[in-house]
Interface confidence: medium
């Protein structure tokens, strides 16, 4: 019968011929009366056999990631008779893995959106690298993920590639972050290869800013001839949030005379001071009113940012009109 062990050949061997093993018949007494032959894909080009001894050699550099095993056939012939000594047999040469492939992130580019002020531990995104090396061969394809850029705001779970928030972020200070993740094979041991990817993390807005008046004091004038409903001027607050989180409502906080009103222009986010009652210069020639501004939509959990509404003082001078 045929005698052989499992055949392995390391990939990427640079030698011109690499001895893999021996294939022989147990009838072979070593007197060179048998001839060994190799057949199948790769026979003669990639692998050769010593016809006398049955020793098999790899004569080409192999790449496991291209082809990980070869199925060949062996024959042994009695030189004197030309007849097969053993039935033709199929055998396998496995290409063993070396760590010659770095991890690659295949789903690039990565982009994620996460609400600002999200608590520590919030999941942002999972990045996954793949390594073409053999996952069953040692640690060649066992990956560890680490953060090259993004501290202290982000962290990555070493074995899963899950990116989490590690420190609260304020969109109004910075609205996007570039995080660089490295994947290293060999679980980080010497000889490890690495690959990196960038993740663009954008912060979505939450209503964590209340509107604040641009001025602590506004000065307006109104003619005593102005009819009720007259717009006598505008006031303006600013809100560092965006979109509906920056929509605001103006109102009167204090007007003992009940002479004025404030309406909100929701397109410009301005407050319009309106004359509610006609004024008379001879009766009262100036007024002071206090206005306040609040956001239109504030979720309950964000009320802590909106405890005290911003206020402003409006000085309103009545202009005298000569009476006939």
């Amino acid at each position: 019968g045929w005698v052989w062990n499992q055949f392995f050949v390391p990939e990427e061997m640079n030698t011109t011929s690499h001895h893999i093993g021996q294939l022989r018949s147990d009838l072979d007494n070593g007197n060179n009366s048998f001839q060994y032959k190799l057949l199948g894909a790769g026979a003669g080009s990639t692998f050769i056999i010593d016809e006398r001894t049955g020793d098999i050699y790899a004569i080409q550099k192999l790449d496991r990631e291209e082809r990980s095993l070869y199925i060949l056939r062996a024959q042994v012939i009695d030189i004197a008779t030309g007849r097969a000594v053993e039935p033709e047999s199929e055998f396998v040469i496995k290409v063993s893995d070396i760590n010659d492939n770095e991890p690659k992130f295949l789903d690039e580019p990565y982009e994620a959106i996460v609400p600002e002020m999200s608590p520590e531990g919030t999941l942002v995104i999972q990045v996954t690298a793949s390594d073409a090396d053999d996952p069953s061969s040692g640690n060649n394809a066992r990956l560890l993920y680490s953060l090259l850029q993004g501290q202290p705001y982000f962290s990555v779970e070493p074995t899963t590639g899950v990116i989490r928030i590690s420190s609260k972020m304020d969109r109004e200070l910075q609205d996007e972050y570039w995080v660089i993740i490295q994947a290293k094979d060999m679980i980080g041991q010497p000889g490890a290869l690495s690959g990196t990817t960038s993740v663009l993390i954008k912060l979505s807005d939450v209503n964590d800013n209340k509107p604040i008046f641009k001025e602590s004091l506004y000065r307006l004038t109104v003619s005593e001839s102005a009819p009720t409903g007259t717009s006598i001027g505008t006031i303006m607050a600013y809100d560092n949030d965006i979109g509906e989180n920056a929509e605001m409502d103006y109102s009167i906080e204090e007007d003992d005379s009940q002479t004025f009103d404030i309406i909100t222009n929701h397109e410009t986010q301005e407050g319009i001071v309106i004359l509610k009652k006609k004024v008379d210069f001879e009766h009262q020639n100036h007024y002071g009113i206090r206005a306040k501004v609040k956001n239109h939509h504030v979720p309950e959990q964000l009320m802590k940012y909106h405890t005290e509404a911003s206020t402003t003082f409006i000085k309103i001078q009545v202009e005298d009109v000569d009476e006939p």
Epitope: L217, R219, S257, Y287, G288, Q317
Partner: antibody, heavy 119, light 107 residues
């Protein structure tokens, strides 16, 4: 420090003119409305005139309207009161005063300058 | 114009006593628009109270203001030697007018 200093007072004949100045320092002069208030000898206080922070509006007491002109130079942090057609009853210590941001009361006063109108 | 009448014209008290000064307006004054000032001889007035009851910065808490409508009061809970002066009320709801003053003198 934060202060107002008046100057320009003196003795003038009835019908004469005088220009008072008030130099401001230690605060953002151009942000405040400014007023002149006077006090006749042994009497109470009387408001005279106001000018808005940017000079856009000016208002006067009936007793001085048409004779006095209030003005300001924000680049020099100075308030002025031009007094024409002076009368004996204009004799007083003239104070410049700063209006607060939130009302028309006066939170800062100068030491005053005396104007005497006498023949 | 709104006329403010202060009473009494003179108040003679000793240090440590309580002083109550009155200011009456000829027509209703919004409480937001009444102030009190202190003036010592040869000095400019000094703001004590605004908005009828709010103490100005740096004013000791022995000074307090109250009132609404046409009647307002300045109270000095315990007179200190430096409190003897003339006190003026001022309304600033319609133009600017001052009361004629109340002199607080040492008895």
């Amino acid at each position: 420090q934060v202060q107002l200093v008046e100057s320009g007072g003196g003795v003038v004949q009835p019908g004469g003119s005088l220009r008072l100045s008030c130099a401001a320092s230690g605060f953002s002069f151009s942000s405040y409305d400014m007023d002149w208030v006077r006090q006749a000898p042994g009497k109470g206080l009387e408001w005279v005139a106001v000018i808005w922070y940017d000079g856009s509006n000016k208002y006067y007491a009936d007793s001085v309207r048409g004779r006095f002109t209030i003005s300001r130079d924000n680049s020099k942090n100075t308030l002025f009161l031009q007094m024409n057609s002076l009368r004996v009853e204009d004799t007083a210590v003239y104070y410049c005063a700063r209006e607060t941001g939130e009302g028309w009361y006066f939170d800062l006063w100068g030491q005053g300058t005396l104007v005497t109108v006498s023949s | 114009e709104i006329v403010l009448t202060q009473s009494p014209g003179t108040l003679s008290l000793s240090p440590g006593e309580r002083a109550t000064l009155s200011c009456r307006a000829s027509q209703s004054v919004s409480s937001s628009y009444l102030a009190w000032y202190q003036q010592k001889p040869g000095q400019a007035p000094r703001l004590l109270i605004y908005g009828a009851s709010s103490r100005a910065t740096g004013i000791p808490d022995r000074f307090s203001g109250s009132g609404s409508g046409t009647d307002f009061t300045l109270t000095i809970s315990r007179l200190e030697p430096e409190d003897f002066a003339v006190y003026y009320c001022q309304q600033y709801g319609s133009s600017w007018t001052f009361g004629q003053g109340t002199k607080v003198e040492i008895k």
